[in-house]
Interface confidence: medium
């Protein structure tokens, strides 16, 4: 999750990731063009709550300061690990032009060419090594290798990098060989659920735009609120039907039938005292629960969820009630009441798909994850437009670790806080073409801005 250029003994020992921009060695962080400068990383030190009560025992505390104390801080609309990019929604050599927002559409509304572009981009992303980022294969204190001279990292594909980010955000704290401490989740069970997954998708969307050379490419969404007991994107035209001889595998007529998973073997990593290194670990699996009478969420569930005015409520965890975030995430019922026997919305869909989708550390391996979370983000975006919450709707402290407003989302790099993503999508350079009535009185169609 760090830039390849910073995975050197020097950078890691000095805890500094401030690469030069271009060939000029003095142009650190693009400073000579006024794009940015190398500065001390700010990490949220406010108290957290929830089940993680250890201190200084996890690489992800005070993210990313266990690894780097100094990184590029970009000015204006500049962005990226060396300030060589633009912020989402901006373009031009000096990031001075507002980009027309890319429009995320219903996957069923894509033209055959658009559909092929999307599925082809995913397949290319699975094969093509990430141009800029690598994954760490050892924990913080072992990152320089046994002799302190060999940084422990691996290249991986653009899509596997996307999977790894999700795995790393939910993996156990490892206290020692074979001793995981399971009380931590930087991307679920708290307010950061919405911002973390939003940024995760934005990173993939940008990587795919670059991969296929199309700046206006947008991720589609899957409107999973059908109330049905079948998956209407699990077809060979989209993400692959079930294989007749083994319904847990994907039909051989689909390009996804040969996709293999990474980061699935949590127990192995805990015993081997390592991190997921991007090795392939077996085929994608789905085992749709619809056959066993489980049904996907309904339009009413979305209406109910969107009627909740509070973004989140104490304890800002999976047992928060009348919390829009917890209802959308699916630990609450869609109306905000708590029933520990019931899953709703996002959680229900993951559970319905089952297989690779059923466990957070492996779920992102299935490309359905992308369109599932795109729709989840669309619901979040509608809530943002509807209620226009102030920044302080988000707790500054006493959310679980990683979920305070100013916490840097783990493991994104360079650091980005939850607050920076608590915006409407048009401020981040994209919007949704939604064909979904959001209340009984309304005519179909959400504004696409």
């Amino acid at each position: 999750q760090f830039p390849r250029v910073c995975m050197t003994v020097d950078s890691l020992v000095n805890k500094e990731c401030c690469p030069r921009l271009g060939a000029e060695s003095a142009n650190v962080c693009g400073s000579q063009q006024g794009r940015g400068q190398c500065t001390e990383v700010r990490a949220d030190t406010r108290p957290w709550s929830g089940p993680y009560i250890l201190r200084n025992q996890d690489d992800r505390e005070l993210w990313p300061r266990k690894f780097f104390h100094r990184t590029c801080k970009c000015t204006g609309n500049f962005a990226g690990y060396n300030c060589g990019d633009c912020k989402f929604g901006w373009t031009g050599p000096n990031c001075e032009r507002k980009k027309p927002p890319v429009i995320r559409q219903n996957i069923h509304s894509l033209s055959p060419q658009e559909r092929e572009q999307f599925l082809g981009a995913l397949d290319l992303a699975k094969k093509r090594v990430h141009p800029d980022y690598v994954i760490t294969t050892q924990h913080w204190l072992g990152l320089l290798g046994p002799n302190g001279t060999q940084p422990q990292f691996a290249n991986c594909s653009v899509y596997d990098f996307f999977v790894w980010l999700h795995y790393y955000s939910v993996r156990d704290t490892l206290l020692g060989p074979g001793r995981p401490y399971r009380a931590i989740d930087f991307s679920h069970q708290g307010p950061a659920f919405v911002t973390w997954h939003r940024y995760h998708l934005l990173c993939l969307e940008r990587d795919l735009q670059r991969l296929i050379g199309n700046e206006s490419f947008a991720l589609p969404y899957w409107n999973f609120a059908t109330g049905r007991n079948e998956c209407d994107v699990c077809t060979d035209q989209l993400f692959g039907a079930a294989r007749p001889d083994d319904p847990t595998l994907i039909s051989r007529n689909s390009r996804f039938s040969s996709w293999e998973t990474v980061c699935d073997s949590l127990d192995d990593y805990n015993h081997l005292v390592t991190l997921c290194n991007g090795t392939y670990e077996g085929l994608l699996r789905r085992n749709q629960m619809g056959r066993n009478s489980m049904k996907l969420p309904t339009l009413k569930d979305i209406r109910d969820c969107l009627s909740l005015q509070k973004f989140d409520n104490p304890p800002f965890f999976q047992n928060s009630t009348f919390s829009f975030r917890n209802a959308l995430e699916g630990f609450d019922k869609a109306d905000g009441t708590l029933d520990s026997q019931v899953m709703s919305l996002h959680n229900l869909v993951h559970s319905f798909l089952n297989g690779t989708n059923a466990l957070p550390h492996s779920a992102a391996n299935d490309p359905i994850f992308v369109v599932l979370h795109s729709f989840t983000d669309a619901i979040f975006d509608e809530w943002m437009k509807r209620f226009n919450p102030p920044a302080d709707a988000w707790p500054q402290e006493l959310a679980p670790i990683g979920h305070n407003r100013m916490y840097n989302m783990v493991p994104f790099f360079p650091p980005v806080t939850n607050e920076e993503l608590f915006l409407t999508s048009d401020q981040l350079g994209y919007s949704y073409a939604i064909d979904l009535p959001v209340s009984v009185e309304e005519t179909p169609g959400w504004p696409t801005t």
Epitope: L141, G176, A183, V273
Partner: antibody, heavy 112, light 107 residues
Framework: QVQLQQSGAELMKPGASVKLSCKAT????????IEWVKQRPGHGLEWIGE????????NYNEKFKGKATFTADTSSNTAYMQLSSLTTEDSAIYYC?????WGQGTLVTVSA | DIQMTQSPASLSVSVGETVTITCRAS??????LAWYQQKQGKSPQLLVY???NLADGVPSRFSGSGSGTQYSLKINSLQSEDFGSYYC?????????FGGGTKLEIK
């Protein structure tokens, strides 16, 4: 193959100090906690505390503060526990452990 | 500090029987609990971690369960090599205290 190899048995006089060692192999020693555990003959297990070798961070059971001191030498992948002002109550087997893996134990006998 | 109350303190059973050992924590430890087996003159060996996960090489007749403050270790169809002492340990914030132990003897 993770292994923790502890130093041999010690016979000590009351009031003396003893330093026990625990050499780790088969994993990245710096990155994971080494715990120390006491077991008196016929008794249960008591957690003394732990050290994170790479940073030197320590956590002690209140009961053993002033009695036990942890150190680590990352160049030899060895953790140490020094026990001071020994009394007969300190006669026990002392284990080091990291996660799922335990050393074979060191017997300390304190006798006049 | 969190207290771990283990019961029973001792147990006399025959080969082939099923036994359950329980451990109660003085507060919620969120499944951060390990079970160990110790034979006379040997170091403890990890059986179960995170309350329900079998450690490498542990036979499937062992199983861990529980959540919150109540946990148990079940051994189905006891074999002669299963006799010895069993300990639970929480690792939910230091100090990581152990239960008092359960001595399992052959009847």
């Amino acid at each position: 193959q993770v292994q923790l190899q502890q130093s041999g048995a010690e016979l000590m006089k009351p009031g003396a100090s003893v330093k026990l060692s625990c050499k780790a192999t088969g994993y990245t020693f710096t990155g994971y906690w080494i715990e120390w555990v006491k077991q008196r003959p016929g008794h249960g297990l008591e957690w003394i505390g732990e050290i994170l070798p790479g940073s030197g961070s320590t956590n002690y059971n209140e009961k053993f503060k002033g009695k036990a001191t942890f150190t680590a030498d990352t160049s030899s992948n060895t953790a140490y526990m020094q026990l001071s002002s020994l009394t007969t109550e300190d006669s026990a087997i002392y284990y080091c452990a990291s996660g799922a893996y335990w050393g074979q134990g060191t017997l300390v006998t304190v006798s006049a | 500090d969190i207290q771990m109350t283990q019961s029973p303190a001792s147990l006399s059973v025959s080969v082939g029987e099923t036994v359950t050992i329980t451990c109660r924590a003085s507060e919620n430890i969120y499944s951060n609990l390990a079970w160990y087996q110790q034979k006379q003159g040997k170091s403890p060996q990890l059986l179960v971690y995170a309350a329900t996960n079998l450690a490498d090489g542990v036979p499937s007749r062992f199983s861990g369960s529980g959540s919150g403050t109540q946990y148990s270790l079940k051994i189905n169809s006891l074999q002669s090599e299963d006799f010895g002492s069993y300990y639970c340990q929480h690792f939910w914030g230091t100090p990581y205290t152990f239960g008092g132990g359960t001595k399992l003897e052959i009847k």
